[in-house]
Interface confidence: low
């Protein structure tokens, strides 16, 4: 499919001008290559009319130009003094006319309306309001006032001062007679439809002395604004419909076959399933304007979008609308990253987030998409050292691997973590990406003790058991803090006995804390990685207390300390059962503690996005 994009249809009137913008991927080659505008012939060829290399056909001499804007990947063709002969099929493109790097454009030039003398022209957008003013003389002040529409050869009464309203205008028209000082009456038509366009005649009086005024009403269908975005990227539709619809329900819909427009999202709470997890309807301003953000753009998102206002929250005749034609460029600069990541309860996930590598110094964010109302995405963590309180000890945002990708690690997973998450930066807003976390059946691969208590001044050894599948991975221990996880020295204690059907390649790697101090209290993670790419992690909270008896603590021998809701493994260490981690500030022995995350986050269900790009929690 050609990555060139422009307007499919351009309509104008004889004598007017048009400006046609064509978009291309702004690669170095594309920015400098030839741009052209050609007319398609009946037998298939395409005759150049104007190009960026200076050529201008005699047909266009003195009335056309082509301007390239390499910095934003567009070029613009301006054509003036249009005639009906200019109607036809054209291409805007790059390189050689026959190469296929082009976009088809249909140009339709129509004859200007043949208007009667003294005709007032009203040009109004679809769905808006028009006021037709009708002057009259004093002698007709007390006589019947009326508005007719010319249908074919015959005038058809639309409204009059005796109270008649044509059924086609019911509920959206009124006739106002100004105060006695002004010799003027007005007809106001709301929620204009395309079918309202045409010639009108307003009249005061019915005899030969009546006053008449001709009006031509042109109802404009909004020209779609062209939007060119990268696959996997993000688009924002800004919709400003005016204060008169500030209190009317708003919607964004996507045109399907014919005139159907399927609601994507509206302010009444409707959202199309295909956009679950990747759409936000941003707050309405007092003037009724709003915006819709869609992330994780897919090929099938391309098409015509309309935003509008109607009490039903969907497109109806007479809705004021704004239009966009979205083109999704498959030659995307945004790298592929998994759209679904799977983890098990008690386990972990490592999510790779792409960002614009030109903005390495930008602040990185990760937020949790919530579907309630119109959608929101509260931040959970950022690269400046802020972590939402409920996620302390189990969430970290790492700048690694860098060069256009950062990593988010979330461990101690529960079913409540299933959902959609957005990767963001405070830089290029087009690089918002979405990932869905799914919680699947299974056991965590890494095995660590439950929360551990260390004694001041003594030595503590904490084991982490790695199965054979991680034999080729680098194994590490680190201490979590709100800016990341600082690596700590660890010892390889040889093969682990914690895994059934696992050979000598399984590993027991221990963290040793010598001469424990108060500063050692906190969350510790063991994990695996390959270079700068992170895999699974497991977390242990180490509490520090005053000395009770002499000696060092080797947690692997703490069989007797096992709490009732933990299961003791043969190797003599504790594994946390698939439960939410308790508040670390309450020690492991104090069991009757509610899960603070449950209270704060409420219940969220996972919705399958149907994505084929899936990733397990333990591999990259």
């Amino acid at each position: 499919k050609s990555p060139i994009f422009g307007p499919e249809e351009v309509n104008s009137v004889e004598g007017n001008s048009v400006s046609i913008t064509c978009y291309y991927p702004p690669t170095s080659v594309n920015r400098h290559t030839r741009k052209y505008w050609c007319r398609q012939g009946a037998r298939g060829g395409c005759i150049t009319l104007i190009s960026s290399e200076g050529y201008v056909s005699s047909k266009y001499a003195g009335r056309a130009n082509l301007t390239n804007f390499p910095e934003n990947g567009t070029f613009v063709v301006n054509i003036a003094q249009l005639s009906q002969d200019d109607s036809g099929r054209y291409k805007c493109g790059l390189g050689i006319n026959s190469r296929g790097l082009s976009f088809d454009v249909s140009l339709e030039v129509s004859q200007g309306p043949g208007l009667l003398n003294d005709t007032k022209v009203y040009t109004v957008d679809l769905g808006r309001t028009v006021t037709i003013n009708c002057p009259f003389k004093t002698e007709n002040a007390q006589k019947r006032k009326s508005l007719y529409k010319q249908i074919g050869l015959y005038p058809v009464l639309v409204i009059d001062s005796s109270g008649y309203v044509n059924p086609n205008y019911t509920g959206r028209i009124r006739l106002d007679i100004q105060g006695t000082g002004q010799l003027l009456f007005s007809v106001v038509i709301n929620q204009l439809r395309l079918s309202d366009a045409g010639q009108y005649l307003c009249q005061a009086g019915d005899d030969s002395n009546s006053n008449k005024k001709n009006a031509d009403l042109q109802v404009l269908k909004p020209e779609p604004e062209l939007v060119y975005e990268d696959l996997r990227g993000s688009v924002t539709f800004h919709c400003a419909l005016g204060p008169e619809v500030a209190n009317v329900a708003k919607f964004l819909c996507r045109q399907s076959s014919g005139e159907n427009c399927d609601v994507v999202v509206n302010t009444l709470g409707k959202r199309a399933p295909a956009f679950e997890g990747r759409i936000l309807l941003n707050p309405q301003d007092k003037d009724g304007s709003f915006s819709v953000v869609i992330t994780g753009l897919r090929k099938e998102d391309a098409g015509r979008y309309l935003c509008g206002a109607h009490s039903d929250g969907q497109l109806q005749e007479g809705s004021p609308i704004q239009a966009w034609q979205l083109f999704v460029n498959e030659e995307s600069t945004i790298p592929r990253s998994p759209t679904v990541v799977k983890g098990v309860a008690g386990g972990s996930v490592a999510v790779l987030c792409p960002y614009n590598r030109k903005e390495s110094k930008s602040i990185k964010y990760w937020c949790l998409w919530e579907g309630a109302q119109n959608g929101r995405c509260p931040l959970l963590v950022d690269s400046e050292g802020w972590v939402k309180a409920q996620y302390e000890g189990r969430l970290s945002l790492l700048e690694e691997p860098g060069n256009g990708t950062f990593t988010v690690i979330l461990n101690q997973l529960t079913s409540r973590d299933a959902g959609f998450y957005w990767c963001l930066t405070n830089g290029d807003t087009l690089w918002r990406t979405t990932v869905e976390i799914k919680i699947i059946e299974g056991e965590p691969n890494l095995k660590v003790p439950g929360n551990v208590t260390a004694v001041l001044g003594e030595t503590l050894k904490v084991p982490c058991h790695f199965p054979c599948k991680f034999s080729s991975y680098e194994k590490y221990w680190c201490k979590w803090n709100n800016t990341g996880c600082q690596a700590l020295p660890s010892q390889d204690e040889g093969p682990s006995k914690a895994f059934v059907n696992c050979d000598e390649n399984s590993r027991l790697v221990s963290l040793t804390l010598n001469l424990v101090t108060r500063a050692d209290e906190g969350w510790y993670w063991c994990g695996v990685k390959q270079g700068h790419f992170y895999g699974e992690t497991a977390a242990v909270y180490v509490a520090v207390e005053e000395r009770k008896a002499a000696g060092s603590r080797d947690v692997s021998l703490a069989k007797a300390d096992a709490a009732p809701d933990e299961k003791v493994l043969d190797s003599g260490f504790r594994e946390i059962e698939n439960k939410a981690i308790q508040d670390p500030r309450l020690f492991a022995e104090e069991k009757a503690v509610a899960d603070t995350r449950d209270q704060a986050d409420g219940s969220r269900a996972s919705v399958d996005s149907g994505s084929s790009e899936e990733q397990g929690g333990s591999s990259r």
Epitope: N282, P283, K286, Q373, R376, L379, W386, N426, T429
Partner: nanobody, 128 residues
């Protein structure tokens, strides 16, 4: 927990100016990190109303109609302090002014209940 502290309130004649400041208690905390920051006001016996709001990294700034052209919101270079410059003050501007911030990336800006962090408020009195 982050706390916001306002200053700059006071008494002024109609037509005068005031500049309100809002500083975050933690130096590590920057307004640039926030999804939205705002100034609200509450006149006696009335509901708290939004005066101005800026979404995350200043992409969109809103002003209530009654202050448009008179009030301007800004942030210092470091992002530690938010300001509300109030010019051509009118008696109807008399109220307690609050700065607020939140970390949610979207939802209704006009609803004060969606804001996580609040200042204690500073009184502005405009006499005719």
């Amino acid at each position: 927990e982050v706390q916001l502290v306002e200053s700059g309130g006071g008494q002024v004649q109609a037509g005068g100016s005031l500049r309100l400041s809002c500083v975050a208690s933690e130096r590590t905390f920057s307004y640039y990190d926030l999804a939205a920051r705002a100034w609200f006001r509450q006149a006696p016996g009335k509901e708290r109303e939004l005066v101005s709001a800026s979404t995350w990294n200043g992409g969109y700034t809103y002003y209530v109609d009654s202050v448009k052209g008179r009030f301007t919101v800004s942030t210092d270079d470091a992002g530690d302090t938010m300001y509300l410059q109030m010019n051509s003050l009118e008696p109807e501007d008399t109220a307690v002014y609050y700065c607020a911030a939140r970390r949610a990336y979207s939802s209704d800006l006009h609803d004060y209940r969606t804001f996580d962090y609040w200042g204690q408020g500073t009184q502005v009195t405009v006499s005719s």
